[in-house]
Interface confidence: medium
């Protein structure tokens, strides 16, 4: 039975040209994480694998940095980066947990960043 829950940074906004940290945290389960995928709609951004470490998709290499922790840092934001982002936790033995973050990239300087947290 899957008992875990994923906490995310929720709905967040950031300024065009700036950067933002996407964070998810899996709790309430004793399952072990074997891989975390970060996706934007249907595009794979990055993978963090237990044994192989991080892989950033070539098309995002210039603007995506892994971390902190199992999170993902998006840099040089454009308005086109607005949209849904998903953290997909592959765990043993529970299976897959998915968290959703909505990012809005704003032209103005009044973007309010959502609360950020560190994975422990």
């Amino acid at each position: 039975m899957m008992t875990g829950t994923i906490e995310t940074t929720g709905n967040i906004s950031a300024e065009k040209g700036g950067s933002i940290i996407l964070q998810c945290h899996l709790s309430s389960t004793t399952a072990q994480v074997t891989q975390v995928n970060w996706e934007q709609q249907d595009q794979l951004l990055a993978i963090c694998n237990a044994d192989l470490g991080w892989h950033i998709s070539p098309s995002f290499k210039d603007r995506v940095a892994p971390g902190p922790g199992l999170g993902l840092t998006l840099q040089s934001l454009t308005v086109n980066d607005t949209g849904e982002y998903f953290c997909i936790y592959h765990t043993y033995p529970d299976g897959t947990y998915t968290g959703r973050i909505f990012l809005e990239v704003l032209e103005s300087s009044v973007a309010e960043h959502g609360a950020r947290f560190q994975i422990p």
Epitope: T30, Q32, V33, T34, D51, G53, W54, P68, I119
Partner: antibody, heavy 119, light 107 residues
Framework: QIQLVQSGPELKKPGETVKISCKAS????????MGWVKQAPGKGLKWMGW????????TYADDFKGRFAFSLESSASTAYLQINNLKNEDTATYFC????????????WGQGTTLTVSS | DIQMTQSPASLSASVGETVTITCRAS??????LAWYQQKQGKSPQLLVY???TLAEGVPSRFSGSGSGTQFSLKINSLQPEDFGSYYC?????????FGGGTTLEIK
């Protein structure tokens, strides 16, 4: 409180086998990987690998593939390091340590088990 | 494999001084770096992870910094209990190698 308690010192001859235990308490054993680190006398730390304490799947650094085996007794919250066909260069202190994320960095350590291999 | 190079290998300092230990990775590891302290005959203790996050219970006189390939651990106002060995370790991808260590001695 969180504790990792390792078995006592070992004196072995070359060619023999040793099995070191690491008993965890104070947390859910299967929620964290367990790593193993070697420290030869007067030397630095060497990452040996880790074991997924839920699936039992081990990962070994290249230098520790073959004669080294990580195993578990989950019901007893205990991890084991077995070294077969012991060599003099296996003389070292071996630490178990609780791994964060994928057993890659360690927030709690055992007290270490000193292994001496000598004929 | 990623190689971690620490410097200096040893240094002497007095109580109250500030010291900095550096660690260089052979390739980019972003901020995936941890620092440990080990006293003679004891097991290592986690000081810093994610390059600059202090582990629970670690005094604020310790601070980590850096990203990419260059990292440092700074200890302000050295205390007698700070003397011992320090190791960096990357936590970017297996194998998660350690640096060679830095021994901090009392002057």
């Amino acid at each position: 409180q969180i504790q990792l308690v390792q078995s006592g010192p070992e004196l072995k001859k070359p060619g023999e086998t040793v099995k070191i235990s690491c008993k965890a308490s104070g947390y859910t054993f299967t929620a964290y990987g367990m790593g193993w680190v070697k420290q030869a006398p007067g030397k630095g730390l060497k990452w040996m690998g880790w074991i997924n304490t839920y699936s039992g799947v081990p990962t070994y650094a290249d230098d520790f593939k073959g004669r080294f085996a990580f195993s578990l007794e989950s019901s007893a919250s205990t991890a084991y390091l077995q070294i077969n066909n012991l060599k003099n260069e296996d003389t070292a202190t071996y630490f178990c340590a609780r791994g964060i994320y994928f057993g890659n960095y360690f927030d709690y350590w055992g007290q270490g088990t000193t292994l001496t291999v000598s004929s | 494999d990623i190689q971690m190079t620490q410097s200096p290998a040893s240094l002497s300092a007095s109580v109250g001084e500030t010291v900095t230990i550096t660690c260089r990775a052979s390739e980019i590891i972003y901020t995936f770096l941890a620092w440990y302290q080990q006293k003679q005959g004891k097991s290592p203790q986690l000081l810093v992870y994610n390059a600059n996050t202090l582990a629970e219970g670690v005094p604020s006189r310790f601070s980590g910094s850096g990203s990419g390939t260059q990292f440092s651990l700074k200890i302000n106002s050295l205390q007698p209990e700070d003397f011992g060995s320090y190791y960096c370790q990357h936590h970017y991808g297996s194998p998660y190698t350690f640096g060679g260590g830095t021994t901090l001695e009392i002057k």
